[in-house]
Interface confidence: low
């Protein structure tokens, strides 16, 4: 093809010419190309009008092209270019007009390009620029040059992993002249020692990220004090898991936050044996979203303080016991992957709508009712990947629930009453791998709105699927894989008029019967892979519903013998539905073992007597 | 397939081969070398990724003396405010990082362990690299 050796991803639009040892821009790519990846080619030098042949370009990736020189007007013809990526080029000479002509540029990535200063970076005319990423460079001064006043659309400025040590009032002067309130600034991994008090006074940012910046608690403390007067929608403070510098910190370290206006706060990877959460976070009592990730927390009773948080996130923290949570305004609580505190204790969260308690190894002595969570507003509840959850109430007071996830927790008493009877609004239910043994036909009674039911990895009495789905008239997705099923009631799916996806894989069915599926007018996907299907269990195989588009019968134990000729022929007739048909292989007889079923030519003659 | 030696410890010998076509060079150092009976140390990685590292996860396929364990998925980078600094690494950017590790040992039987590490990243998801580690375990060696 004309574009070779490049790869045509989307004809006339997207071409990938990565790592092809090109020394110059290829000339066999269509004029109409919009996305061009030339990364990892030794281009070394970009002269004027280098891309004249690609006037429609919107995305140009020049990562690691060993580019040392970019001349005036190198991109002059690219008036539609919105993204230019220069990552990993050892640029030594950048002409003043290097980026001229880029009248639509929105994203400029100049990561690891030997950039030593923003002052000499010739981008002042790029008025459309929304994102400037100059991370992993040699920039020492945080002074935002005067030309920034032209960049009125700037939303993201990434200066992480540079060499910035000091931030002075004059550095941010230009921001006072700009109507930016949407700017996100990332200064992580700069060795910041000093922020002059007042430097951020009356500046508004959307997000400020300061992670692994300080190698000393006192420096961190004085720098936070130096942020006084800043108004920021989201502040992210802390360290990276692989870039740890700070010792155990104390409450005085964060006192400077009292002088900031913050809407959302996140603290990550700091070792603080928090003795008193109120003292530590009293400056953050009024933020709307509060997040702690990988922080050691000891005394936890203080979460009952009058914090006005609407979203609380506690992830991978260490607790001694499950915290007492009494937060009147809280709407969302994410409490996941925490250590310690193995028994759930009641919380009082009257405004709560979203609760994620997954991956904590928690045990619940009684689940679930309004009294457990102190709310009647709950819509989302995730209790997955926990320990033993004993079902003792059928969600009284939690009738608003729409999403319920128990997967990989150990559910007890599931077959003693209709556990979900109250949940008329539930749309999503996952009880996969919960050690549930279905021995009660009313298990799913009440789930009138349910659309998705995942129950893989459980078991049924006598390995028989009974009529348990009677109420699920709105179900569209049903996963019954890995349930050790051997048989099913012919009327098991009778009421599932809206069912589109049915997964019966990884069970112990020995024969295939189309009868139970004839009443599924919306069925599109039926997965019977990884069973032991040898044949059909009746001579007259019906047709599957006409809606069926995908039938997976791979990895079964097909018997490729004369007595099953009609079944094998029927399979061939379904060829247009079959998924990965080449993986449907004969298991018996031994001389045909491993042969693809569809390639068989079985000609059977009557035995002569 | 060329084997790249990583290290030897008192109870293990570790090497790897590439299990993808590309075989983009990756440098791995472990100090001190992993002991299967339990150890802690530093893993140093030097790598230039051929795609953005964001939303990185590993598929782990572990084989113990030819017996395959179920696939494990380990999410490393979720996409924003990530745990590790290298999660923000872009295609073509040098990743030169040290990650501490520690694990309490479990008793492993003597033999050969294979661990295929498929690194998947980006959006749309594609393979970043694939390494097949060979770990020869000699529990009683000194």
């Amino acid at each position: 093809e004309s574009w070779e050796p490049c790869v045509e991803v989307v004809p006339n639009i997207t071409y990938q010419c990565m790592e092809l040892k090109f020394y110059k821009i290829p000339d066999n790519i269509p004029f109409s190309t919009k996305n061009l990846d030339l990364s990892f080619n030794p281009l070394r030098h970009l002269g004027s009008y280098s891309f004249l042949r690609f006037p429609e370009l919107q995305v140009l990736d020049l990562s690691r092209c060993e580019i040392q020189t970019i001349e005036d007007g190198a991109y002059q013809s690219l008036s539609h270019l919105s993204t230019l990526i220069l990552t990993g080029n050892p640029i030594q000479s950048l002409a003043l007009g290097a980026f001229s002509g880029l009248s639509s540029l929105q994203k400029l990535v100049a990561v690891e390009t030997n950039l030593a200063s923003l002052e000499n970076f010739p981008i002042g005319h790029l008025k459309t620029l929304k994102e400037l990423n100059v991370a992993h460079n040699l920039i020492q001064s945080f002074k935002l040059p005067e030309y920034f006043s032209n960049l009125t659309n700037l939303e993201h400025l990434d200066l992480s992993s540079n060499k910035i040590q000091n931030i002075y009032c004059k550095d941010l002067q230009v921001l006072h002249q700009m109507p930016l309130s949407n700017l996100s600034l990332d200064l992580s991994l700069n060795p910041i020692n000093f922020i002059q008090p007042g430097a951020f006074k009356e500046i508004r940012l959307h997000k400020l990220t300061l992670r692994s910046n300080f190698d000393d608690l006192n420096v961190m403390k004085t720098c936070i004090q130096g942020l006084a007067g800043l108004e920021v929608h989201r502040l992210v403070l802390g360290e990276f898991r692989n870039e740890r510098n700070l010792e155990e910190f104390d409450k005085s370290s964060l006192e400077g936050l009292c002088n900031l206006t913050i809407e959302e706060f996140r603290l990550t990877y700091l070792d603080c044996y928090l003795d008193n959460i109120i003292d530590l976070f009293n400056c953050l009592a009024n933020v709307s979203s509060f997040s702690l990730v990988s922080v050691n927390i000891k005394r936890v009773e203080d979460f009952s303080y009058n914090f006005r948080w609407q979203h609380l996130e506690l992830v991978n923290c260490k607790f001694e016991q499950f915290p007492t949570l009494e937060l009147k305004s809280l709407k969302r609580l994410t409490f996941t992957a925490n250590k310690g505190g193995n028994a759930f204790s009641e919380v009082d969260l009257p405004s709560l709508e979203f609760l994620d308690l997954s991956r904590n190894g928690l045990s619940f002595k009684g689940c679930c009712s309004q009294s457990d969570f102190g709310t009647t507003s709950l819509k989302y509840l995730d209790l997955s990947f926990n320990d033993v959850i004993t079902m003792s109430s059928n969600f009284l007071g939690l009738e608003q629930l729409e999403h319920l996830d128990f997967q990989h927790s150990n559910l007890k008493q599931m077959s003693q009453f209709s556990v979900f009877l109250s949940l008329r609004n539930l749309i999503y239910l996952d009880i996969s791998h919960t050690h549930t043994r279905v021995a009660f036909n009313g298990i799913f009674d009440g789930l009138l709105s349910l659309k998705v039911l995942k129950m893989a990895g459980n078991s049924f009495q006598e390995n028989f699927l009974p009529d348990i789905f009677t109420d699920l008239k709105n179900l569209t997705f049903l996963d019954l894989s890995q349930c050790q099923l051997e048989q099913l009631s012919p009327t098991a799916f009778d009421t599932l008029n809206k069912l589109q996806v049915l997964n019966m894989s990884h069970n112990n069915f020995f024969s295939l019967d189309t009868f139970p599926y004839k009443c599924l007018p919306s069925l599109q996907v039926l997965d019977y892979s990884l069973n032991h299907i040898m044949t059909s269990n009746n001579q007259e195989l019906q047709h599957f519903p006409s809606s069926l588009a995908f039938l997976n019968l791979t990895q079964n134990d097909f018997a490729c013998t004369c007595e099953h000729q009609s079944f094998l022929q029927w399979i061939k007739d379904q060829r247009q539905l079959l998924v990965e048909a080449e993986r449907m292989e004969c298991a018996t007889p031994s001389d045909k073992q491993g042969m693809p079923v569809l390639s068989l030519n079985i000609t059977c003659q009557m035995n002569k007597t | 397939q060329k084997h790249y030696w990583v290290c030897n410890s008192s109870d293990a010998s570790i090497s790897y081969t590439y299990c993808d076509k590309m075989q983009y060079p990756i440098s791995i150092n472990v100090n001190p070398c992993i002991k299967l009976k339990g150890s802690r140390g530093l893993l140093h990685i030097f790598y230039i990724p051929r795609r953005d590292v964001k939303q990185l996860y590993f598929n782990l396929y572990i084989t113990v003396n030819s017996m395959t364990l179920p696939k494990r998925k380990e999410v490393i980078c979720r996409g924003s405010d990530d745990d590790y600094s290298f999660c923000r690494a872009l295609k073509g950017e040098t990743v030169n990082t040290t990650v501490s590790f520690s694990f309490k040992g479990i008793k492993f039987s003597k033999g050969k362990y294979k661990c295929v590490v498929e690194a998947i990243s980006g959006s749309p998801e594609e393979m970043l690299f694939c390494l097949e580690f060979d770990i020869i375990h000699q529990p009683n060696s000194n």
């Epitope: 006192n218 403390k221 004085t222 104390d250 409450k251 005085s252 006192e255 603080c272 044996y273 928090l274 003795d275 008193n276 003292d279 530590l280 000891k298 005394r299 001694e320 | -």
Partner: antibody
């Protein structure tokens, strides 16, 4: 309200080991904070000796490191100080205290005088 | 270790008078400095934390200031019950250290 109470012999012979216990009420010593020993020779200033963290970790004043042990008995909710090879200069009022989160000491026992003399 | 030097060692003051005690650290300790009051035969009592933050229940005549290496404890209008020895303590790093103390006596 947390309360701390030191106890132990008021007289110890030179070269012997001084042993004191601090009984804590109103808060579990494994529930948080760190638990410290401070001493004050008669008519002199205060000297910090060391602590045991709620996790069991200990740290000591380098000047005493070779002679000091701090341990705990969680079942009795108390922690103890042992100072070996004592001499007359170890004569002091010994205080136990609880550290707050800024390495400050808001809660102290009332102190117990230990005299080293033969 | 960080050495704290307190001055004066001793002060004799008349009631209602202002008392100023200084504490100097051998290296910068930010504001990780706390003040204690100790009356005869009593254990020390925390007065001021982080150089200038009053502890609840402590009379408002006690105040603190300073940052870095130089700190001051001020008793604005001395009362008879304030007769005691006052100690500064740094919490910047272990080992924790105390100043030598300032004894305040009522004339």
């Amino acid at each position: 309200q947390v309360q701390l109470q030191e106890s132990g012999p008021g007289l110890v012979k030179p070269s012997d080991t001084l042993s004191l216990t601090c009984a804590v009420s109103g808060y579990s010593i494994t529930g948080g904070y760190s638990w410290h020993w401070i001493r004050q020779p008669p008519g002199k200033g205060l000297e910090w000796m060391g602590y045991i963290h709620y996790s069991g970790y200990t740290d000591f004043n380098p000047s005493l490191k070779t002679r000091i042990t701090i341990s705990r008995d969680t079942s009795k909710n108390q922690f103890s100080l042992k100072l070996s090879s004592v001499t007359a200069v170890d004569t002091a009022v010994y205080y136990c205290a609880r550290k707050d989160s800024g390495r400050l000491l808001p809660y102290w026992g009332q102190g117990t005088l230990v005299t080293v003399s033969s | 270790e960080i050495v704290l030097t307190q001055s004066p060692d001793f002060q004799s003051v008349t009631p209602k008078e202002k008392v100023t005690i200084t504490c100097r650290a051998s290296q910068s300790i930010s504001d990780h400095l706390h003040w204690y009051q100790q009356k005869p035969d009593q254990s020390p009592k925390l007065l001021i934390k982080y150089a200038s933050h009053a502890i609840s229940g402590v009379p408002s005549r006690f105040s603190g200031s300073g940052s870095g290496t130089d700190f001051t404890l001020t008793i604005n209008s001395l009362e008879a019950e304030d007769a005691a020895t006052y100690y500064c303590q740094q919490g910047h790093s272990f080992p924790l250290t105390f100043g030598g103390g300032t004894k305040v006596e009522i004339k």
